[in-house]
Interface confidence: low
Amino acid sequence: ASGTEAATATPSKVWGSSAGRIELRGGGRGALPTSMGQQGPSAQARAGRVVGPRSAQGASPGLRVHKTLKFVVVGVLLQVVPGSAATIKVHDQSVGTQQWEHSPLGELCPPGSHRSEHSGACNQCTEGVGYTSASNNLFSCLPCTACKSDEEERSACTRTRNTACQCKPGTFRNDDSAEMCRKCSTGCPRGKVKVKDCTPWSDIECVHNESGNGHN
C-alpha cells in the first residue's frame, strides 16, 4: 500500500478548475497530441472501468463550439483559481450521479465526468449543464455553452460534448468574424456571379463572370 499525505483544506462550496488542464491527448484520446475531438469511448463505455480484484464484476468552422472551446479551455483551466471571483460553481450532483473508484495513482476521469476535489472520485457531469469531452482531472465539468441570440442550436450539450451553436439562416461567421454572426451578402458585385450560397460559416462566393459560367 502507498502512503498518503493529504493536505487538510477546508472544503469550499465553490470549485475552481485550476486543478489542471483537461487531458486532450491519450486515454480515450488518440496519438499525442490530438485535437479537441478525441476518439475514445463514451463515458458510458468507460464507466465500467472500476478497478478491483478479479472477484469483482469482472467539424466545421461555422460551429461556434470549436472556437469557443479553445478559449474556454485556456480561460477556465489556466486562469481560474479556487476561491477567486472567476470560480465556477458546480451544480449539485449528489443525486443520481455515478462514481467510479478512485486510486491515488489512478487514471484520468473519463469523458463525461470530472474529478471530485474532496473525495478524488470521478463524478458524472449533469446532462445539459456541464460536460467534459476528454479524459481529465478537472475539479468541475466545463459549463455548457448557451447559444447567443443570433445563433441557433445545432446539437444540444451532452455530458461529453458542448452545445454546438451556429449562425441562424441568412447569417454567417468566419475567421474574420469569430465573435458575431454577420448578414450574408444579398448578391454579387457587378461583373461577378454567385457560385456558392451563404452557409453558417461562410458568405456567398462570387467569381468573375467569364470563369463562373456553368457553375450555378
Epitope: 500500500a1 502507498s2 498518503t4 499525505e5 493529504a6 493536505a7 483544506a9 486543478a19 489542471g20 488542464r21 487531458e23 491527448r25 491519450g26 486515454g27 480515450g28 484520446r29 488518440g30 496519438a31 499525442l32 476518439q39 475514445g40 469511448p41 468507460r46 465500467g48 472501468r49 472500476v50 478497478v51 478491483g52 480484484p53 478479479r54 472477484s55 469483482a56 469482472g58 483551466l77 489556466l78 486510486s103 491515488p104 495513482l105 489512478g106 487514471e107 484520468l108 474529478r115 478524488g120 482531472n137
Partner: antibody, heavy 121, light 118 residues
Framework: EVQLVESGGGLVKPGGSLRLSCAAS????????MHWVRQAPGKGLEWVAG????????YYADSVKGRFTISRDNAKNSLYLQMNSLRAEDTAVYYC??????????????WGQGTLVTVSS | QPVLHQPPAMSSALGTTIRLTCTLR?????????VYWYQQRPGHPPRFLLR?????????GPQVPPRFSGSKDVARNRGYLSISELQPEDEAMYYC???????????FGSGTQLTVLS
Amino acid sequence: EVQLVESGGGLVKPGGSLRLSCAASGFTFSTYGMHWVRQAPGKGLEWVAGINYSGNNKYYADSVKGRFTISRDNAKNSLYLQMNSLRAEDTAVYYCARDHSTWLSRHLDYWGQGTLVTVSS
Amino acid sequence: QPVLHQPPAMSSALGTTIRLTCTLRNDHDIGVYSVYWYQQRPGHPPRFLLRYFSQSDKSQGPQVPPRFSGSKDVARNRGYLSISELQPEDEAMYYCAMGARSSVTHVFGSGTQLTVLS
C-alpha cells in the same frame, strides 16, 4: 521543449541525508503531477514518490515511507526529494518524471537524465 | 509473487516482429487496467512508449513510431507490446506498468531485455 534536470546526487554515508532537485522547463509546471523513480545499478525501475500538481497530495513507496519527503515549488518550477536516514539499498540513479495529468497516473511522459545517489561508508 | 511479471529476456532478428508480454497476477483483472510500456536504452532514461486499454482507448508517446503497438488478452490476463520491423536501436529494456490501484508497491514490471539479432 520539455526539460527536466536533476541535481543534488552524490556520495553519502549510511544514515546521512541528501536533497535532490529537479528543475523543470518547457511546460506549465504547476499543472502537472510529478514523480521520482529510481533505478539501482543493474536493476529495474522502482517508483519512489509522487506529488500532485498543487503539492496537496503526496504518495510514497513503502520502502521510503517516513524517510523521504517529496515537495515542489511551483513558483520556481522545481521538484524536490528530501532523503533522510539513507541506507545502502537507496543507492540508485534517481529520475524526475512528469506525469501526463494533474494528479498521478502511471503515464510518465517525460523523464530527466537522472542523478546518481551512492550510499556507502 | 510480483503483481506484474515480464520474461527477463527475449530476442528476435532484424526486420521481424516481436511481442513482449506483461502478465498481471491472477487476483487482478486486466480487463479494467490500462497497460503502460516504457523503453530504456543502455545509458539513457526511460521513455514512455504507449498506453493501451482497448483498440479505441489508447495513446502513443511523443515521437513514438506506429511500429510500437499495444494489445491485451483478457482471458490470459496479459498485456502485450508488439514491435514490428525490428531495428538495431530497438535493443533495450522494456518495462510495463498498469493502472490503477491504490497500492503502488509494484508500479513497474521487472523488465524484459530485448536483443535484436543481426
